[in-house]
C-alpha cells in the first residue's frame, strides 16, 4: 500500500494518507447526501474484516450510473490487490443480506476510522 | 460548559512514576467521537503531545515515550489518568489534558484544555 | 515526525494592525493544521481547526489559510484582548506536533 497514488495528490502516497483521503471521501458522500444515495441501490453487506476492501469495491463496483459513489469506487481499487469486475465475489464471502449503499458507505466509514484512529494503515 | 482539570504531584524524585489525573466535566467518554489527550511543555520549550485515548479505549502513544507511557480511563468518575514511568529532571514540565471530538474528518484539534499542572522533577 | 516550524517568535504591533503568523511543516500536512491561543493566567484556546474552520465563539477577525506545507494564522485587526502567545500544531500524523509559538505584544 506504499504506492497508492492519484487520489488527492501526484506520486506515492503514504498509507495513513490514502486511508484519511478514503475517510474524507466517504465523509464527503455521508454529509452532502441530500435524495436517497445511489437512488436506493442496494448492495451485499460485507465482512469489516480482513479483505474488507476488496469485498467492498466487489460490493459497490455492481452499482452503476452513481457518480456519487465513482471516486470511492476508485478509491477502494487502489487498496484492493486485484482487478475487481462487476458481478466478481471472490472476496464476498457472504452474501446473505442486502443494504441500501447509504448505510453500507456509513458502515464502512465507521469501521475505517477505528482502523486509522488504531493506525492500522494496511 | 466544557471543563478540565489536571492534578498530580508538583515534586517527583527521578526514577520515580508520575502519575497524572485529569478529571473533566460537560462531556463524557462514553459518548462516540470523544477522546482526551495529555500534552506537556517544558520551561521554554514547545508542547509535547503524549498520550491519546478514545471513547472506545483506543489508545495512542507518542513513539518516543510509549515505553514509559499508560494512560486510562474511568468513565463512572470522568477521569483519565496518565502514568509516566522513570521520571527524569528533563521531564520538568507542565502537564496539560485536553479534549478532542473526532466527528467527520479526524482533526486532532483539541478544542478544551485544562489549566495545567506543574511537575517538578529533582531529587 | 513532522516538524513544525512558526515565525516570527514574537511581534509587536498597534492596535487595529494586521497581524500574519506563519508556520510551515516539514512535509505536506493536507489541511491538517490547528491554531490556538494562550492568554496569561488563562487556559489554552482552540482559535482554528483544519486550516480555516473557526472554533465556535472565536472572532471573526481570526481566520487561517494556507494548504501543503505553509499555514497562515491572520488577525484582521489587532485587539487588545488578542495580546497572548499563538501555536499551531499539526493533526495529520500521530505523534502530534506544536509550532514553538508566537508571542504578540500591543505597542
Known amino acids: 500500500l506504499t504506492c497508492l497514488g492519484g487520489f488527492a495528490s501526484p506520486g506515492p502516497v503514504p498509507p495513513s494518507t490514502a486511508l484519511r483521503e478514503l475517510i474524507e471521501e466517504l465523509v464527503n458522500i455521508t454529509q452532502n447526501q441530500k435524495a436517497p444515495l445511489c437512488n436506493g441501490s442496494m448492495v451485499w453487506s460485507i465482512n469489516l474484516t480482513a479483505g474488507m476492501y476488496c469485498a467492498a469495491l466487489e460490493s459497490l463496483i455492481n452499482v452503476s450510473g452513481c457518480s456519487a459513489i465513482e471516486k470511492t469506487q476508485r478509491m477502494l481499487s487502489g487498496f484492493c490487490p486485484h482487478k475487481v469486475s462487476a458481478g466478481q465475489f471472490s472476496s464476498l464471502h457472504v452474501r446473505d443480506t442486502k443494504i441500501e449503499v447509504a448505510q453500507f458507505v456509513k458502515d464502512l466509514l465507521l469501521h475505517l476510522k477505528k482502523l486509522f484512529r488504531e493506525g492500522q494503515f494496511n | 460548559e466544557v471543563t478540565l482539570k489536571e492534578s498530580g504531584p508538583v515534586l517527583v524524585k527521578p526514577t520515580e512514576t508520575l502519575t497524572l489525573t485529569c478529571t473533566f466535566s460537560g462531556f463524557s467518554l462514553s459518548t462516540s467521537d470523544m477522546g482526551v489527550d495529555w500534552i506537556r511543555q517544558p520551561p521554554g520549550k514547545a508542547l509535547e503531545w503524549l498520550a491519546h485515548?478514545?471513547?472506545?479505549?483506543?489508545?495512542r502513544y507518542n513513539p518516543a515515550l510509549k515505553s514509559r507511557l499508560t494512560i486510562s480511563k474511568d468513565t463512572s468518575k470522568s477521569q483519565v489518568v496518565l502514568t509516566m514511568t522513570n521520571m527524569d529532571p528533563v521531564d520538568t514540565a507542565t502537564y496539560y489534558c485536553a479534549r478532542t471530538v473526532s466527528s467527520g474528518y479526524i482533526y486532532y484539534a483539541m478544542d478544551y484544555w485544562g489549566q495545567g499542572t506543574t511537575v517538578t522533577v529533582s531529587s | 515526525d513532522i516538524q513544525m516550524t512558526q515565525t516570527p517568535s514574537s511581534l509587536s504591533a498597534s492596535v487595529g494592525d494586521r497581524v500574519t503568523i506563519s508556520c510551515r511543516a516539514s512535509q505536506d500536512i493536507r489541511n491538517y493544521l490547528n491554531w490556538y491561543q494562550r492568554k496569561p493566567g488563562k487556559v489554552v484556546k482552540l482559535l482554528i481547526f483544519y486550516t480555516s474552520k473557526l472554533h465556535s465563539g472565536v472572532p471573526s477577525r481570526f481566520s487561517g489559510s494556507g494548504s501543503g506545507t505553509d499555514y497562515t494564522l491572520t488577525i484582521s485587526s489587532l485587539q487588545p484582548e488578542d495580546v497572548a502567545t499563538y501555536f499551531c500544531q499539526q493533526g495529520n500524523t500521530l505523534p502530534l506536533t506544536f509550532g514553538g509559538g508566537t508571542k504578540v505584544e500591543i505597542k
Open positions: 485515548i478514545w471513547w472506545d479505549d483506543v489508545k
